[in-house]
């Protein structure tokens, strides 16, 4: 019995269906096929869980959180023992292992390993201003999404004809910050932050209005 090499890892957007491949070759009829899928969750590597079991011509449930969401992609018994996971959750991310036994066939590699990463688009980011908006001050524009896997990058732009930030601005796309030094009237305007990752984007807007000092009355 020989389990085929799997592609390594599967990526899927949260809520979508993941298909985890596992197939094997055997010299014996599929009369005594046993297949178990286990997961080592990324969130808790010390607490592996059973996902699904096929034994004695029957399917058995694994951990409660997989109930009703998991099944074999084809009619069992078969040499393709891939599974699907519906409505994928962030907690489904982990290392999945299929273990196959088909007596009397012995020997060979009877375990396959596939990683699953559940991707999450950036949630609507929050745009904030830190610092005084008085003329000549330094301000920091802050942008961050609570959710997003892979971790989002943040791109700030000024919503004017050029879409360019003021010349005194420096941007950190990882942290989601823009520092604008010595703000002037030209710094005023609408700024947009675009949070993006491999599977989506999300934006927020911020209105920066530079306050000019009031002329002193005599």
């Amino acid at each position: 019995l020989e389990v085929s090499e799997s592609p390594g890892s599967v990526q899927v957007a949260r809520g979508q269906t993941a298909v985890l491949p596992c197939a094997f070759s055997t010299s014996a009829a599929l009369l005594n096929l046993n297949v178990i899928w286990m997961v080592i969750p990324l969130s808790n590597a010390n607490q592996p869980e059973q996902v699904i079991l096929y034994q004695g011509g029957q399917m058995f449930d694994g951990a409660l959180r997989f109930h009703g969401r998991v099944g074999f992609t084809g009619t069992m018994p078969a040499t393709n023992v891939s599974i699907f996971i519906n409505n994928t959750q962030l907690s489904d991310t982990g290392t999945y292992q299929c273990l196959v036994n088909n007596l009397p066939d012995r020997g060979g590699r009877n375990i396959g390993v596939t990683g699953l990463t559940v991707l999450v688009p950036p949630s609507a980011p929050q745009c904030q201003i830190q610092g005084s908006q008085d003329l000549g001050s330094d301000v920091i524009l802050l942008c961050s999404s609570e959710e997003g896997i892979p971790r989002p990058t943040y791109l700030w732009e000024k919503l004017d004809n050029t879409l360019k930030l003021p010349p005194t601005a420096t941007q950190d796309q990882v942290q989601g910050t823009v520092t604008i030094r010595n703000i002037s009237a030209l710094s005023s305007g609408l700024y947009q932050c675009v949070a993006s990752n491999a599977i989506g984007t999300s934006t927020c807007l911020l209105d920066l209005q530079v306050i000019s000092p009031q002329p002193r009355s005599v």
Epitope: I36, M38, Q50, Q58, L99
Partner: antibody
């Protein structure tokens, strides 16, 4: 023919730990789940958890989570069950058991049992 | 968790008679029920799995039936070696659970 041979009886103080071993012979060890089942005096059987040695990771009943550790050594075909923070209610015969397939389903091979007595 | 309730707790039967043991599950377990025999000082012995399939080497006088929540173990003609405690076990739901057992004693 599969045989499961367990370690001998133990007497332990409350609050201490006990580790019981179960050596398998006569079959493939790595791919089959070894479960641990206990039986208090005059009581029914109680499944504690199990391990599939090839995965090296165990599955526990919620009741014992955090207090029991089940491990396996493929090189010696031996499974272990360690129970910590012992109390008098843990006095029981502890059995290792193996089923015909991977999952902790039903058990057709049993060890002879290990009596663990918890007493001050 | 799935609770298995066995009845009666004790059954007094004469050798050669028929014994009928009941096991009720608190929730559906399909046909995923096993029956074990246990004698004093011994480990349990698997008799029946999948509700009605006899394990290897088990005499034909032992038979099982039922699905869902109601299960029965029948010993058609009790032999002297059959006096023991009989337990049911479900393997559909986690955790795996056992009934408290029915003691079959000589009348």
């Amino acid at each position: 023919q599969v045989q499961l041979v367990q370690s001998g009886a133990e007497v332990k103080k409350p609050g201490s730990s006990v580790k019981v071993s179960c050596k398998a012979s006569g079959g493939t060890f790595s791919s089959y789940a070894i479960s641990w089942v206990r039986q208090a005096p005059g009581q029914g059987l109680e499944w504690m958890g199990g391990i599939i040695p090839i995965f090296g990771t165990a599955n526990y009943a919620q009741k014992f989570q955090g207090r029991v550790t089940i491990t396996a050594d493929e090189s010696t075909s031996t499974a272990y069950m360690e129970l910590s923070s012992l109390r008098s209610e843990d006095t029981a015969v502890y059995y290792c058991a193996r089923g015909r397939g991977f999952g902790e389903l039903y058990f057709d091979y049993w060890g002879q049992g290990t009596l663990v007595t918890v007493s001050s | 968790e799935t609770t298995l309730t066995q009845s009666p707790a004790t059954l007094s039967v004469s050798p050669g008679e028929r014994a009928t043991l009941s096991c009720r599950a608190s929730q559906g377990v399909r046909s995923n029920i096993a029956w074990y025999q246990q004698k004093p000082g011994q480990a349990p012995r698997l008799l029946i799995y999948d509700s009605s399939t006899r394990a290897t080497g088990i005499p034909a006088r032992f038979s099982g039936s039922g699905s869902g929540t109601e299960f029965t173990l029948t010993i058609s003609s009790l032999q002297s070696e059959d006096f023991a405690v009989y337990s049911c076990q479900q393997y559909k739901n986690w955790p795996r659970t056992f009934g408290q057992g029915t003691k079959v004693e000589i009348k």
